[in-house]
């Protein structure tokens, strides 16, 4: 049998060692013990007796099915206990009694049906993170389950086979920063929502089929809910259930962020937020994020005119990888407060973008992200966006553009342009001179000779440049990132000619370790201040005898350098 490996600070690794029991020879010097992925099955009362100073104990996926009642009695210093993904079909309060220092407890993925006969956690007054439940058997949440817990940073409950939720079970925890609920359906959602309304700041609902969700007024007094963020991940919605969900918002007046991630909408966007009060109650929502929204009938999707008024005050919208091909002009015009819009990984083309960015569209927009769409003409794109008078930042990376022309028009306030991964081979004066930040990384550029008088940051990594660009092109440059090109050398004169340069990232190039380069690096210890990833990413490519050596360590031969 293999043994533990421990370092000087008492951190011991026993993962995947085929242990069939807790190994012998544990000592009080151990601070952290990881016995995950073993076949331990049983923890006896003396097995951990010697570990009086243990702070971290990780026993996940070790096939444990039995733990003696007093197995953890000597672990008064324990702060982190992970028993996840074992075979514990019942849980005992006697395990946790001695663990008064515990801050993190993971009991998830064990096949218990309830959290035990009596309250498990009354002594865990320092607990900050608790993870419980499983996919298949955890079926009941009761009032006694969380007794003794008053405040948690994170609570995660996997209750994907929940059959009974005893009203007020979660109410005893007065403050929960982040609650993650895995519920397969909405049966108990209203009851749970009522119980957590006054305690949870961030509610994350996972894997829930909300297709049959129906609102009914909550049995709560006037509450001031601290909830700021609400996220749905892997949920299923219909047009009708979306309308019903909106009615919950009247109880969370401080809500500022809503997120839908990997959700399915079995509908056409025929939303009808009938309650006029819902509109005013969305007033504080500033950020709406939608990622990977699957709409089986997306080609029949409505124009969303019924929710225009809901979104008038929203400042940040992300709709990513969701088959968006058009934001109707009238919708864009209603997004009066929008400052940030991210439409990455969608189906936008110039023709429809023109409609989206019509006159009066997105009047407050400062940042637009159109990365990985189907844009082809840089010139057309710039022209279309001239309507956006406040646009300062544009990301059109990961679109495959035709070669750029010599001149283009862009919104006059634009300061940041991302053209990375667009297949460009040559940069021309199409790029606006007003830029302060330009990203052209991951393209096919073998030179860069464009004068950009205001440019402060240039990102040009993963191209084919053989030398650093001429410093006179960028009189106020502060940052240049030029990793993974074909740069063979840089000199004192080159670096000195960038008067304001503070950061240069030039690692992973093909450095020719000449006498000049090596003597420069040896004589200039201050390089470490300016070069990012120095010295590890700066390696000699040639001559052959120095190949793979760090520039810092390479020594030129006396013969070569003093001929």
């Amino acid at each position: 049998q293999e043994s533990l490996s421990c370092d000087a600070s008492g951190v011991c690794d026993g993962r995947s060692r085929s242990f069939t029991s807790i190994p012998s020879g544990l000592t009080a010097a151990m601070k952290s013990l990881d016995l995950s992925f073993n076949k331990i099955t049983y923890i006896g009362h003396g097995d951990l007796r010697a570990c009086a100073n243990l702070q971290v104990l990780i026993l996940k996926s070790s096939r444990i099915n039995t733990i003696e009642g007093d197995a953890f009695y000597s672990l008064g210093s324990l702060e982190h206990l992970d028993l996840s993904d074992n075979h514990l079909s019942s849980l005992s309060s006697s395990w946790f009694g001695p663990l008064s220092s515990l801050k993190y407890l993971n009991l998830m993925g064990n096949p218990y049906q309830t959290l035990g006969v009596t309250s498990l956690f009354p002594n865990l007054t320092n607990l900050q993170t608790l993870r419980i439940g499983n996919v298949e058997t955890f079926s009941e949440i009761r009032r006694i389950d969380f007794a003794g817990l008053t405040s948690l940073n994170e609570l995660e409950i996997k209750a994907l086979s929940l059959r009974n939720y005893q009203s007020q079970s979660l109410k005893s925890i007065r403050d929960i920063h982040h609650l993650t609920l895995h519920l397969s359906e909405s049966a108990f959602l209203l009851e749970i929502f009522a119980d957590i309304l006054s305690s949870v700041r961030y509610l994350e609902l996972r894997d829930t089929n909300l297709a049959r969700f129906q609102f009914s007024p909550l049995p709560v007094d006037e509450v001031s809910s601290p909830m700021k963020k609400l996220a749905f991940r892997g949920s299923v919605l219909t047009d009708e259930s979306f309308n019903e969900l909106l009615k919950l918002l009247r109880y969370i007046l401080e809500l500022s962020e809503v997120e839908f991630d990997d959700c399915t909408l079995n509908g056409l966007g025929d939303f009808n937020p009938s309650e006029s009060d819902v509109v005013s109650e969305l007033g504080k929502v500033e950020t709406v994020t939608i990622r990977r929204l699957h709409i089986p009938q997306f080609y029949l999707f409505y124009d969303l005119s019924t929710v225009y008024s809901l979104l008038e005050k929203v400042k940040r919208i992300t709709v990513e990888n969701s088959k968006v091909f058009l934001v109707p002009c009238s919708f864009s015009q209603h997004l009066k407060s929008l400052e940030f819009l991210d439409l990455s990984e969608n189906l936008m083309v110039e023709e429809y973008l023109k409609n989206s960015a019509c006159k009066g569209a997105w009047p407050s927009l400062q940042t637009l992200v159109l990365s990985q769409n189907h844009l082809r003409s840089m010139q057309k794109t710039g022209e279309i966006l001239l309507t956006l008078k406040n646009l300062t930042s544009l990301d059109i990376s990961r679109n495959t553009f035709h070669p750029m022309p010599d001149s283009c028009q862009w919104p006059e306030k634009m300061r940041f342009l991302n053209l990375s991964s667009t297949g460009i081979r040559v940069v021309k004066t199409c790029i606006p001179q007003t830029l302060e930040v330009l990203d052209v990384s991951n393209n096919n550029l073998d030179s860069f000779s464009l004068f950009l008088p205001r440019l402060q940051e240039l990102y040009i990594s993963r191209n084919k440049l053989k030398t650093l660009p001429d410093a006179s092109l960028f009189p106020v440059l502060l940052v240049m990132k030029i990793r993974e090109n074909a740069v063979s050398t840089f000199s004192k004169d080159q670096l000195g000619s960038f008067p304001k340069l503070e950061t240069l990232e030039a690692g992973d190039n093909h450095f020719v370790c000449s006498c000049e380069l090596l003597s420069f690096t040896m004589e200039t210890p201050a390089l470490a201040q300016i070069l990012v990833d120095w010295p590890d990413s700066y390696l000699c490519d040639s001559p052959p005898r120095l190949h793979g050596h760090r520039l810092q360590d390479a020594r030129p031969s006396v013969l070569e350098c003093h001929q």
């Epitope: 499983n134 996919v135 298949e136 058997t137 994907l160 086979s161 895995h182 397969s184 359906e185 996972r206 894997d207 829930t208 089929n209 297709a211 991940r233 892997g234 299923v236 990997d262 399915t264 079995n266 990977r292 699957h294 089986p296």
Partner: nanobody
Framework: EVQLVKSGGGLVQAGGSLRLSCAAS????????MGWFRQAPGKEREFVAV????????DYASSVKGRFTISRDNAKNTVYLEMTSLEPEDTAVYYC???????????????WGQGTPVTVSS
């Protein structure tokens, strides 16, 4: 209506690997949560793994976690169960199932495959 057809079972030595697949007919495959269950002789049917509609979420029974991997290909209307480090205790008839709810509770699945036997010899 979704019909489920399975393949890939058989006899394997302890420590070996097998890949089960379950092909669905019909064009609505991507609307379903897919699960794998198994039933050993003389025992109740038990949950093995579940995957959501997009493939972005997966969950496993603790007895197979780290050894089995569930995946799906919506373009091919197929769900897979990759089984490695097989043990004699994994011997059972394996079923794939389709339903509307992401759960390990077999009663919530509406459509079932016919089952394929897996025998792990020591």
């Amino acid at each position: 209506e979704v019909q489920l057809v399975k393949s890939g079972g058989g006899l394997v030595q302890a420590g070996g690997s097998l890949r089960l697949s379950c092909a669905a007919s019909g064009r609505t495959f991507s609307r379903y949560i897919m699960g794998w269950f198994r039933q050993a002789p003389g025992k109740e049917r038990e949950f093995v793994a579940v995957i959501n509609r997009s493939g972005g979420s997966t969950d496993y029974a603790s007895s197979v976690k780290g050894r089995f991997t569930i995946s799906r290909d919506n373009a091919k209307n197929t769900v897979y169960l990759e089984m490695t480090s097989l043990e004699p205790e994994d011997t059972a008839v394996y079923y794939c199932a389709a339903g509307e709810y992401y759960t390990g509770s077999s009663s919530r699945y509406d459509h079932w495959g016919q089952g394929t036997p897996v025998t792990v010899s020591s």
